[in-house]
């Protein structure tokens, strides 16, 4: 018959306060004959949570079936977990004697904590846009946990990041904690799309690990770059030109037209389109009058992109002689 | 259903043998301390043998060298051999399975009579 | 040998009695006492292990108490049934020993 071993698989078992907790222990060897008992605590001290072979203990009920000759399992179910309850359980093995049963082997303990699951982390951007090729700070905090390891991770697309700060507060013992971390994140152009993620993994969370996220487009600015052009067929006695606006987010922006300094309200049609970055394109169309018109007109697209300063293009309008002298029905 | 049945018990004169049976049906023999119990007529009880789980044996004192527990585990069954029997033997014997962890008695047989007599 | 001594030895109790049966161990048994009760012609029937723990089948109305060396069965309320010799046995330790029995009879 092979020496009796107390196993005791957990070194800790974390538990949530009202929830039931189960204490494993198994034996390798039926003998010596004599019960099993659990206590918490270590020495003269120790507290008696259940015994196999008498007492009643209403919060305490065994996983197996004890009357069963062939049982080797003496692992056991606390109810109603308060945080008067944590400790160090023990499982340990009594030979029957008289006056009293001889302690004969005790498992290894397993320590109950209270545990508690981090809130969602909650990711913050920065308060103003940025543009790409500079560097954003992005917060994540969670609250609430327990015990206080825990493991923080910043990814960006899927890509785990680098440059961050993480702390857990407090430092000394309590019995909740809150983490807070800051990433520094460079900003590329095709950011709009992009997201960064925090994410929290503890062990209450069993493997499953909270995810807090932010999309990069709430703290990107891409900056348009402008295209001034002439189109070179003429309609009638107009020439049309196109300022075309590229790759730009946010959406906002206000274009206006000048000819020759003044003003124009007369922007004859515009479209926007998304790019497949998240970024937008928005091309407006000028039709300029010709007829009367002397050689050296200059138009100027300008915009303003997001509350930035504005930006603008000038066009000095070819007008040649042939185009002049275009009628407006002639047909090429 | 877990039960115990004795056989084997009988007449023998002074100085003989006998060899008790006790058949488990129910349960594993081998898994439980097992117990021989005897009971002279219109006397008390008397512990007589036992054999644990691990095969270790003892015996009472008025017995011990002339009586040998012993198992068959194939068989599922229990045996009492009882040598150099004497007078003082004759009583009904009772084969008891030994509890779960304390090895308190659970259940017993319905005995055999064993008679020493010339 | 651990010496268990039962009293008394007879009982003659009415249907509807409370009557207590005691057991005394030479030396200190812990709790490893059992109780039993044999009818005539009949096997013993296990009652009480640990001193006060029923097995199962067996109605309330039987319990046990005590520790060390000093037992007590008691019955609550006698029925027809009840009336038997009742055994206590001490099993801390080989030789198992039994008392001498306590025979209840009808009054």
């Known amino acids: 018959e092979e020496e009796l071993q107390m196993i005791q698989p957990e070194k800790l078992l974390l538990v949530t306060v009202g929830k039931t907790a189960t204490l494993h222990c198994t034996v390798t060897s039926l003998l010596p004959v004599g019960p099993v008992l659990w206590f918490r605590g270590v020495g003269p001290g120790r507290e008696l949570i259940y015994n196999q072979k008498e007492g009643h203990f209403p919060r305490v009920t065994t996983v197996s079936d004890l009357t069963k000759r062939n049982n080797m399992d003496f692992s056991i179910r606390i109810s109603s977990i308060t945080p008067a309850d944590v400790g160090t359980y023990y499982c340990v093995k009594f030979r029957k004697g008289s006056p009293d049963d001889v302690e004969f082997k005790s498992g290894p303990g397993t320590e109950m904590a209270l545990g508690a699951k981090p809130s969602a982390p909650v990711v913050l951007g920065p308060a103003a846009r940025t543009t790409p090729e500079h560097t954003v700070s992005f917060t994540c905090e969670s609250h609430g946990f327990s015990p206080r390891d825990i493991t923080l991770k910043w990814f960006k697309n899927g890509n785990e990041l680098s440059d961050f700060q993480t702390n857990v507060d407090p430092t000394g013992q309590s019995v909740a904690y809150s983490i807070r971390s800051t990433a520094r994140v460079v900003l590329d152009p095709w950011d709009v799309r992009s997201q960064v993620i925090c994410e929290v993994a503890h062990v209450t969370l069993q493997g499953d690990p909270l995810r807090g996220t932010a999309n990069l487009s709430e703290a990107i600015r891409v900056p348009p770059t402008l295209e001034v052009t002439q189109q070179p067929m003429r309609v009638g006695n107009q020439v049309n030109v196109t300022c075309q606006v590229r790759k730009f987010y946010p959406q906002s922006l206000q274009l206006t037209w000048s000819e020759n300094g003044n003003v124009c309200q007369r922007e004859t049609a515009s479209t926007l389109t998304e790019n497949k970055d998240g970024t937008y394109n928005w091309t407006s169309w000028f039709l300029v009058n010709i007829s009367d018109q002397r050689d050296d007109v200059v138009l100027t697209c300008q915009v303003k992109h997001d509350g930035q300063l504005a930006v603008s293009k000038r066009l000095a309008l070819e007008v040649t002689v042939h185009q002049k002298d275009q009628s407006s029905d002639a047909t090429p | 259903e877990v039960q115990l049945v004795e056989s084997g018990g009988g007449l023998v004169q002074p100085g003989g043998s006998l060899r008790l049976s006790c058949a488990a049906s129910g349960f594993t023999l081998s898994s439980y301390d097992m117990h021989w119990v005897r009971q002279a007529t219109g006397k008390g009880l008397e512990w007589v043998s036992a054999?644990?789980?691990?095969?270790?044996?003892y015996y009472t004192g008025s017995v011990k060298g002339r009586f040998t527990i012993s198992r068959e585990n194939a068989k599922n069954s229990l045996y009492l051999q009882m040598n150099s029997l004497r007078a003082a033997d004759t009583a009904v014997y009772y084969c008891?399975?030994?509890?779960?962890?304390?090895?308190?008695?659970?259940?017993w047989g319905q005995g055999t009579m064993v008679t020493v007599s010339s | 040998d651990i010496q268990m001594t039962q009293s008394p030895s007879s009982l003659s109790a009415s249907v509807g009695d409370r009557v207590t049966i005691t057991c005394r161990a030479s030396?200190?048994?812990?709790?490893?006492l059992a109780w039993f009760q044999q009818k005539p012609g009949k096997a013993p029937k296990s009652l009480i292990y640990?001193?006060?723990s029923l097995h199962s089948g067996v109605p309330s109305k039987f319990s046990g108490s005590g520790s060390g060396t000093d037992f007590t069965l008691t019955i609550s309320s006698l029925q027809p049934e009840d009336f038997a010799t009742y055994y206590c046995q001490q099993y801390v330790s080989y030789p198992y020993t039994f008392g001498q029995g306590t025979k209840l009879e009808i009054k």
């Open positions: 640990t001193a006060s």
């Open positions: 008891v399975r030994g509890g779960v962890w304390d090895d308190a008695f659970d259940i």
């Open positions: 030396q200190d048994i812990n709790n490893y």
């Open positions: 054999i644990g789980t691990a095969g270790d044996t």
